[in-house]
Each structure stands twice: as C-alpha cells, then as structure tokens.
C-alpha cells in the first residue's frame, strides 16, 4: 500500500453533507495576531 502526502490543487468535495464547501475560498482578511 502507498501513503500519499498529496499535492496542492483545486478540488471537489464528494460528500454533500460534510459541512465544508467544495473548494473553500480564501478568507479576504487576516485576524489580528
């Protein structure tokens, strides 16, 4: 078996009720600290 550490890319979520968006947008502001 092979363990993968993956890549960084856009992706799609296959489970509709995970509570997470298919490809979350980057937040436009940073919290202080």
């Amino acid at each position: 078996s092979e363990t993968t550490t993956g890549t960084s890319s856009n992706s799609s979520q296959s489970t509709s009720n995970s509570g997470l968006a298919p490809n979350p947008t980057n937040a436009t502001t940073k919290a202080a600290g």
Epitope: T7, S11, Q13, S18, G19, A21, T25, N26
Partner: antibody
C-alpha cells in the same frame, strides 16, 4: 456506525517530533476528505490540516501556523490518515481530533509539548 | 481569517425553557453555489465534539427537532425550544465556506 480512532499522543520536548495516526471504520474512507483539528484552553478549537481525495490529486491544505512543520498523509488501503509533526512548539499542545469534515469526529489524542 | 463570534459565553437555563445562541461571522458565509456552510457542534463534558446542524439549518440524523438553526450571510442562531439535561455542554459554530475553517469561541450551556 462510523468510528475514527486516533493514536500516537504523548509528551515531547520543544523542537521534537510526533506522528498521529487515525484509522476509520464504518464508512467508505476513500470518499471522504480527512482533517485534523486541535483543541486547547488557549486557542479553543482550531482546524489544522486537510487531505482530499485521489480524484482531487490528494490536495492538501494547512493552517498557516503549521505550514512547513506538519505533514498530512493518507493511505486509503488502510483507511488511515496521518499527521507528522516536526519542530514542535509549546503552542502545539492540545487534543488532536481526526475528522471527516464537520460530521464525524474521533475521540481525540493528547499532545503535550514541554521541557 | 474569518472571525466567528459567539454570544453569550455562558447560558444558564432551566430544564424545559428555551435557549438561544448567536454566531456572527466577519465575512459572509454564502458560497458561490448558493449554499451557506455554517455548522453547529455540541461538545459534552469529557467527549469529542458532535455535529448537530449543517448548512445553517439541516439537522443531523438522531438530533432532536427541538434544535433549530437559522440565519444567513453573517448572522446565525441556534435555538433549543425546550432544554433537556442531555443538552448541557459547549456549543460551537464552525464555518466551512472560507479557508482556513474557523470556529466560534463556544457557548457553555449550564442547567439551572
């Protein structure tokens, strides 16, 4: 019934390393994004890392504070996800949960970073 | 990062009475597909978090219908119509629209 079981917690000195494992049962593991979330009295609940599906080229995301130090991986044949943590800091201490998203959570495993 | 602000910090409620928790986000949680990825979790003492509600108002399997989620944009509410003893614990909101995913600070529900 879905079950996520973490292992690998313990005490480590600052600058040290630790690896967590999480094995899933009761679900089609390869169909689920997998995440690590941590909880501490100081920071509350904090999402740490995510690895997506083979069909997503196993895309990975990290919270900024762990980039370059933590590495998430998965082995679909073993229904397992891993979190390798290096150069640990005191602020990394807490309970680490394996989660599928927001829906299923493991029981948590505790990391203490202290000299 | 998207800041999730929960109020109140602590809620002391008599069994059988209603309870309401507010969660406000620093940015809209409406995603481009028209869905809003706002979830509510309950962490009972000594346990891991358990999800109650996803997509603002959808109840997870086995969650009693005395729980109701509502809201849109940046303003969300979790209501319990009649609090029961098993409802005690800490309630968290978490947004899954923006990266990184962020949690509210929690609201501790105590039974009077």
């Amino acid at each position: 019934e879905v079950n996520l079981e973490e292992s690998g917690g313990g005490l480590v000195q600052p600058g040290g390393s630790m690896e967590f494992s999480c094995v899933a049962s009761g679900l089609t593991f390869s169909d689920h994004w997998m995440n690590w979330v941590r909880q501490s009295p100081e920071k509350g609940l904090e999402w740490v890392a995510q690895i997506q599906l083979k069909s997503d080229n196993y895309a990975i995301r990290y919270v900024e504070s762990v980039k370059g130090r933590f590495s998430i991986s998965r082995d679909d044949s073993k229904s397992s996800v891993y979190l390798q943590m290096n150069n640990l800091r005191a602020e990394d201490s807490g309970i680490y949960y394996c989660t599928t998203g927001t829906d299923y959570w493991g029981q948590g495993t505790t990391l203490t970073v202290s000299s | 990062d998207v800041v999730m602000t929960q109020t109140p910090l602590t809620l002391s409620v008599t069994i059988g009475q209603p309870a309401s928790i507010s969660c406000k986000s620093s940015q809209s949680l409406l995603y481009s597909n028209g869905k809003t990825y706002l979830n509510w979790l309950l962490q009972r003492p000594g346990q891991s978090p358990k999800r109650l509600i996803y997509l603002v108002s959808k109840l997870d399997s086995g969650v009693p219908d005395r729980f109701t989620g509502s809201g849109s944009g940046t303003d969300f509410t979790l209501k319990i119509s009649r609090v029961e003893a098993e409802d005690l614990g800490v309630y968290y909101c978490i947004q899954g629209t923006h990266f990184p995913y962020t949690f509210g600070g929690g609201t501790k529900l105590e039974i009077k």
